[in-house]
């Protein structure tokens, strides 16, 4: 699998999309996991609804949401209020039994907020009770890693 890079701005929302063959993965739940080290396990962050037919319903775990368009074959992950510690390597997965097939490897990069030098009073921070369903999602910049690029620093 090639790795696709998604760049987002700190404090904003980043949307990651993972396309897949909707027939090949019919009936399968999906998940978003974070790769722990270059050869380490992929730790589950969030998965789609337990009932596959309800996969279109957005599920949250903390600031990460997942929703699946099972007909169109697109898994969408939203990272809300992106922080520097969110940067890293992730995977979109298709689940069957206890197995997981990788749909896409994703490298999330967090860019500094160009506005962060301004007075905080100039910025809008949504309250805890406010819905994020209609919040503006910053368009992500994505690209595939070039040959030879590595998502992790080399280890000795």
């Amino acid at each position: 699998h090639n790795t696709t890079v998604f760049q987002g701005v700190a404090g904003q929302s980043l949307q990651v999309s993972c396309p897949y063959d909707s027939m090949k993965h019919w009936g399968r739940r999906k998940a978003w996991c974070r790769q722990l080290g270059e050869k380490g396990p992929c730790q589950r962050v969030v998965s789609t609804h337990n009932l596959w037919l309800l996969s279109f319903l957005r599920r949250w775990n903390g600031s990460t949401a997942i929703t699946d368009d099972t007909l169109g074959g697109t898994l969408t992950i939203t990272l809300r209020n992106l922080q520097p510690h969110d940067a890293g390597l992730y995977q979109c997965q298709s689940l069957h039994g206890s197995e997981a097939d990788t749909l896409r490897k994703v490298l999330v990069e967090v860019l500094a907020d160009p506005l962060d030098h301004r007075d905080a009073g100039d910025l809008w921070f949504p309250g805890e009770s406010e819905s994020f369903e209609d919040a503006h999602v910053e368009h992500s910049i994505s690209r595939s890693l070039l040959e030879g690029e590595i998502p992790f620093p080399p280890t000795s």
């Epitope: 063959d21 027939m23 090949k24 009936g27 739940r29 009932l51 069957h96 039994g97 206890s98």
Partner: antibody, heavy 123, light 107 residues
């Protein structure tokens, strides 16, 4: 009506090559995984591997890795199981089966089976 | 690999009897288990999937239960056509593995 029709019985000598087939009809062949299962004489069932004809993505059992090749030709709705050099121990009945994912379970089960192809390898 | 162990390996029963076959997985497989029936010279037939869901067209006398490592297939009232060999199969992980089979014979 969903049907998987397998090629006829084969009698071969050790060292010979062989390719058996499984033709699907009555459903969208390219949209379901196809598995191959071995049953040696008087024995149980052994899963050999699975292929998705849509893109030929394959899962092979470690027990059969390097022993057989699984392939598919989606244009003619046919899956294949082949050997490059048969052994006497390959003598068995070989079944193909459609692998169906049940949406409220998110795993797959073999819901339709071919009639089986008997392969006999003897000098 | 996950090992599947069936018991008994054979059982003799009469028409009308209630028969229970058990299947044990070497590790937890949630409810990812199927039961198949095979008659001599024929292909296996899916009876039960997801441990307890009956496949379309399978008579209600067949039922499955269990989760984790221990599973059972029950035939509530044996019919003449039920004498066959029964296999369990895990759908938890690759490689898919089957039990060794339970032969149900007429007493």
């Amino acid at each position: 009506e969903v049907q998987l029709v397998q090629s006829g019985a084969e009698v071969k000598k050790p060292g010979e090559s062989l390719k058996i087939s499984c033709k699907g009809s009555g459903y969208s062949f390219n949209s379901y995984w196809i598995a191959w299962v071995r049953q040696m004489p008087g024995k149980g069932l052994e899963w050999m591997g699975t292929i998705y004809p849509g893109d030929s993505d394959t899962r092979l059992s470690p027990s059969f890795q390097g022993q057989v090749t699984i392939s598919a030709d989606k244009s003619i709705s046919t899956a294949y199981l082949q050997w490059s050099s048969l052994k006497a121990s390959d003598t068995a009945m070989y079944f193909c089966a459609r692998s169906r994912t049940f949406y409220y379970d998110s795993s797959d089960y073999f819901d339709y089976w071919g009639q089986g192809t008997l392969v006999t390898v003897s000098s | 690999d996950i090992q599947m162990t069936q018991s008994p390996s054979s059982v003799s029963a009469s028409v009308g009897d209630r028969v229970t076959i058990t299947c044990r997985a070497s590790q937890g497989i949630s409810s990812w288990l199927a039961w198949y029936q095979q008659k001599p010279g024929k292909a296996p037939k899916l009876l039960i999937y997801a441990a307890s869901s009956r496949q379309n067209g399978v008579p209600s006398r067949f039922s499955g239960s269990g989760s984790g490592t221990d599973f059972t297939l029950t035939i509530s009232s044996l019919q003449p056509e039920d004498f066959a060999t029964y296999f369990c199969q895990q759908a938890d992980s690759y490689p898919r593995t089957f039990g060794q089979g339970t032969k149900l014979e007429i007493k």
